[in-house]
């Protein structure tokens, strides 16, 4: 009896694992084995596919074959008993195109109100992703074990911290990888759960802000308690993509080690041009807080996003405010080459009730003022680019008295 060729061959590639599955074409025939050959592009001859010769099952693994994953390959299969079936040719394919990203490895560390997630590719030193290893981004789904309400977090790197969690609470999450450059989305990791720790005695510092004064950066933060010491650390932001690299080291800012105030001042030349992450930690001598949330700090924007300079022309019922380029030390104006939006705060000198105007224009009218009344004005600039989302500090307040009635011309 002639053996029939196997049918419906499926090629599954996950990371560096190459699996073939097929259907027996004749279930009634026993003791049949199956063998594969492969052919590379531009070659006439067929080569025996190691790992897939004389297979008794309907699945084989040819991961040991060292293929160029970007090169097209063709496979063929036949059944064998005393005689052999005709060859069945599988549609040619390029391994890289066909490959799926496997589940990443996930390691969790708990803090009281945060979880640190360490993610690494499921296959270490993968051949398939050798040229794309640093292009992996990850997304995750996290939920409270007790509620099951899921939150999705997209586009994270291989070391990520989730903040604003509840102490002593079990959270579960799963992670998948993506190679956006190749339009590949991976499969989820198994679910990992971890319980956050008991609430720390000392909370981390909050609301960290960087501003520029003269040739210095001023770093400010808020803290709940008095009589504390603080330390500040920084990291090159791009190293977040490379947490396994030996250069991933948080560094000290010397002028911000063991400071006793909720701010520190350090020279601008501490940082070269670039994007950095900053974090702050509090200590009372006995206990230490967890690190604050990390803030992104772009020297190019920070250095030049100075508070606006403005002049006020006073009328009886309004102020005309003319915003000019901010001045750097030496009284030279700074050229801002990105669009800005201005936030103007004004209030009656005798009251704390502030009013706010947001304007793109550099000449602004503050309406509905009372005559012969002292009003104070301060302003700050914001970048309009959502990604940068930077703000200058407020300018010093300028106070002016409105004119007597009927001088609105």
């Amino acid at each position: 009896k002639n053996l029939k060729s196997p049918q419906k061959v499926e090629v599954d590639i996950i990371d560096d694992n190459f699996i073939l599955r097929w259907n027996r074409s004749d279930e009634s025939v026993g003791n049949v084995t199956f063998s594969f050959d492969y052919q590379k592009t531009g070659m006439d001859n067929w080569i025996k596919l190691s790992g897939c010769q004389n297979i008794t099952s309907t699945k084989c693994n040819f991961s040991s074959l060292k293929l160029n994953v970007y090169e097209e390959i063709k496979l063929r299969i036949r059944a064998e008993k005393e005689n052999t079936s005709s060859w069945y040719e599988v549609d040619s394919f390029t391994p890289f195109r066909k490959a799926q990203i496997g589940p990443p490895e996930v390691h969790l560390e708990a803090e009281d109100k945060a979880i640190v997630i360490h993610i690494s590719p499921g296959t270490k030193d993968s051949v398939m992703w050798a040229l794309d290893g640093l292009s992996f981004t990850y997304s995750l789904v996290i939920w409270k074990n007790s509620s099951g309400v899921e939150e999705r977090i997209e586009n994270i790197y291989s070391r990520h911290k989730i903040y604003k969690l509840s102490p002593e609470t079990t959270y579960c999450l799963k992670v998948k990888a993506a190679l956006l450059t190749s339009w590949k989305i991976g499969v989820y990791s198994p679910v990992h759960c971890i319980k956050t720790t008991v609430e720390n005695e000392l909370p981390p510092p909050e609301n960290i802000e960087v501003s520029v004064q003269n040739q210095n950066y001023v770093l400010k933060w808020d803290y709940t308690y008095a009589n504390m010491t603080f330390q500040v650390q920084w990291l090159h932001a791009f190293l977040k993509r490379n947490p396994g690299n030996h250069l991933y080291k948080w560094k000290q800012i010397p002028d911000c080690e063991n400071v006793k105030t909720t701010q520190c001042v350090f020279p601008q030349n501490v940082f070269q041009k670039g994007i950095y992450l900053l974090r702050v930690q509090a200590s009372d001598g006995n206990n230490t807080s967890f690190w604050s949330e990390e803030i992104k700090f772009d020297t190019e924007i920070q250095a030049f996003l100075l508070p606006p300079v403005f002049n006020i022309r006073s009328l009886s019922d309004s102020f005309h405010i003319y915003i000019g380029a901010p001045k750097q030390s030496g009284n030279t104006p700074v050229i801002q080459d990105y669009p800005l939006i201005y936030e103007i705060i004004f209030w009656e000198n005798t009251s704390n009730a502030e009013r706010k105007i947001i304007e793109k224009k550099t000449d602004v009218t503050v309406p509905n003022l009372k005559p012969l009344t002292v009003y104070c004005v301060k302003a700050r600039a914001h970048t309009m680019d959502e990604k940068l989302n930077k703000s200058s500090v407020f300018s010093d307040a300028v106070c002016e008295k409105t004119k007597p009635g009927n001088t609105s011309k």
Epitope: A130, N245, H246, K249, K251, Q252
Partner: antibody
Amino acid sequence: EVQLVQSGAEVKKPGESLKISCKGSGYIFTNYWIAWVRQMPGKGLESMGIIYPGDSDIRYSPSFQGQVTISADKSITTAYLQWSSLKASDTAMYYCARHDIEGFDYWGRGTLVTVSS
Amino acid sequence: EIVLTQSPGTLSLSPGERATLSCRASQSVSSSFFAWYQQKPGQAPRLLIYGASSRATGIPDRLSGSGSGTDFTLTITRLEPEDFAVYYCQQYDSSAITFGQGTRLEIK
């Protein structure tokens, strides 16, 4: 000004021990790795290992693991490279270099070690 | 460990000519952690290029670096007498940092 000042040339006999030094100044010593690089006569550069004085993290290159010991004393901003038993094949110029994301951006002038019976 | 292979071993050119030095890695290296150095006889090496393409302080724009993955190139557009030296590539993607064996650039 960033400077790495290395200790002077050494002439030793096989089997003897040796410790050479590299003192960093003009920068925050604990914020940068220090690398040790060997250059045998007429040959190329070989990275032996690196140390991060901030937390004493040490990484040896595979071919130098167990052959040398790298250490640092951050209180005096100095890194060290030592041998417990020198061989003639250790004869070389040894450089220290400051290492960060810009590679090895500052180098010492080198310490020439000669091992001969 | 990652092996870096430089080619050619020796390059003989005249001042004013263009030099192209190649470095191939045995496995993919992040371009963020790739550098080129110059060494002259009796001197310590000097950093030229880091991050595959960024010039170090004081390096003239006649020198440029390019490449990614496993193939990197150092180009010197108009050779000056002071450019004749040995050039090394380096990867620091892994903490087992490695150098290429060097390319000697000599005057023809």
